[in-house]
């Protein structure tokens, strides 16, 4: 499955939108930094078969979509930017779902992939727990926004590596 060029453009657009969503100066939030233990090894495309990598990407985008689709998220961000961001993610999910169906038929996805998906889910659980603990404060959301920008950048790099493998 070849991810369309529009997919990587969508990823870039999503990153730009997320960059524009900040409402407060991040400089006031330094003390709120937190180690979410991003599962970096899951974004290393070299150790995966293509089907596995696409599944991990899909889980990453799905969890990001879920995180920014909550009521608490709606209250935190400017509505029109949030809607555009969610639309970009939704389009990426559609692209990836088509690929997941295509690729899983070609390769058997081993249990290792379930571990990778679980690692991504646990990562987002840590992010959600942090937001709950910080009572969804503006600074907590600002820290999460920075973290998601970082993980989306990792996703973009993984997609680039997948394209080079084709």
């Amino acid at each position: 499955c070849d991810l369309p060029q529009t997919h990587s453009l969508g990823n870039r657009r999503a990153l730009i939108l997320l960059g524009q969503m900040g409402r407060i100066s991040p400089f006031s939030c330094l003390k709120d930094r937190h180690d979410f233990r991003i599962p970096q090894e899951e974004f290393d495309g070299n150790q995966f078969q293509k089907a596995q990598a696409i599944s991990v990407l899909h889980e990453m985008i799905q969890q990001t979509f879920n995180l920014f689709s909550t009521e608490d998220s709606s209250a935190a961000w400017e509505q029109s930017l949030l809607e555009k961001f969610s639309t970009e993610l939704y389009q990426q999910l559609n692209d990836l779902e088509a690929c997941v169906i295509q690729e899983v038929g070609v390769e058997e996805t081993p249990l290792m992939n379930e571990d990778s998906i679980l690692a991504v889910r646990k990562y987002f659980q840590r992010i959600t727990l942090y937001l709950i603990e910080r009572k969804y404060s503006p600074c907590a959301w600002e820290v999460v926004r920075a973290e998601i920008m970082r993980s989306l950048s990792f996703s973009t790099n993984l997609q680039k590596r997948l394209r080079r493998k084709d």
Partner: antibody
């Protein structure tokens, strides 16, 4: 390879203006903040201020607020430190360094080589 | 502003010695403390971040510990290339502040 390359040494007279630069390469320039640190001859490190190149938001140390201006041009991956009217006490080595912002990652992990500014009549 | 106080301001040691430098913050900074090494005429180099995380490429003889207000940098066995000035820096809040430095000299 991540690099921060600073502009060359400057010799100026009191009252003159100056703008020194710090060019980032080998990483996404807008994904990191750039901080500026002063070191006067034979003295320790003093944090001056910081900029987020993605939107040019800045924060200054109270000691340097109003004394210097920090700016950035993300199109050429360059941050700047400028003075409108230099004093002899501005004589120092100035370093830029990158900062991961709100991400949990090493602070000031890469530094420029420093720009020596000498102000003398 | 958060004040950072290092001790000692200088020390003399021999190759192979265990060296300990302490840093105290004027208020709690959790674990948001970094340690840097600077050699004459060179830019500072990050050694330890978030109190105890070893920066990539830094030898394991360097270690950091502490949280709250009291922090320690330890060099387990001093090497010739370790003679330098060491700075702590709080990364908890703006304005960021450095300790005054500890110069490690050859005995």
């Amino acid at each position: 390879e991540v690099q921060l390359v600073q502009s060359g040494a400057e010799v100026k007279k009191p009252g003159e203006s100056l703008k020194i630069s710090c060019k980032g390469s080998g990483y996404s320039f807008t994904s990191y903040w750039i901080g500026w640190v002063r070191q006067m001859p034979g003295k320790g490190l003093e944090w001056m201020g910081i900029i987020d190149p993605s939107d040019s938001d800045t924060a200054y140390s109270p000691s340097f607020q109003g004394q210097v201006t920090i700016s950035a041009d993300k199109s050429i991956s360059t941050a700047y430190l400028q003075w409108s009217s230099l004093k002899a006490s501005d004589t120092a080595m100035y370093y830029c360094a990158r900062h991961p912002g709100l991400n949990w990652a090493p602070d000031f992990d890469y530094w420029g080589q420093g720009t020596l500014v000498t102000v003398s009549s | 502003d958060i004040q950072m106080t290092q001790s000692p301001s200088s020390l003399s040691a021999s190759v192979g010695d265990r060296v300990t430098i302490t840093c105290r913050a004027s208020q709690s900074i959790d674990g948001a403390l970094n340690w840097y090494q600077q050699k004459p005429g060179k830019a500072p180099k990050l050694l330890i971040y978030f109190a105890s995380s070893l920066q990539s490429g830094v030898p394991s003889r360097f270690s950091g510990s502490g949280s709250g207000t009291d922090f320690t940098l330890t060099i387990s066995s001093l090497q010739p290339e370790d003679f330098a000035t060491y700075y702590c820096q709080q990364a908890y809040d703006f304005p960021l502040t450095f300790g005054q430095g500890t110069k490690v000299e050859i005995k």
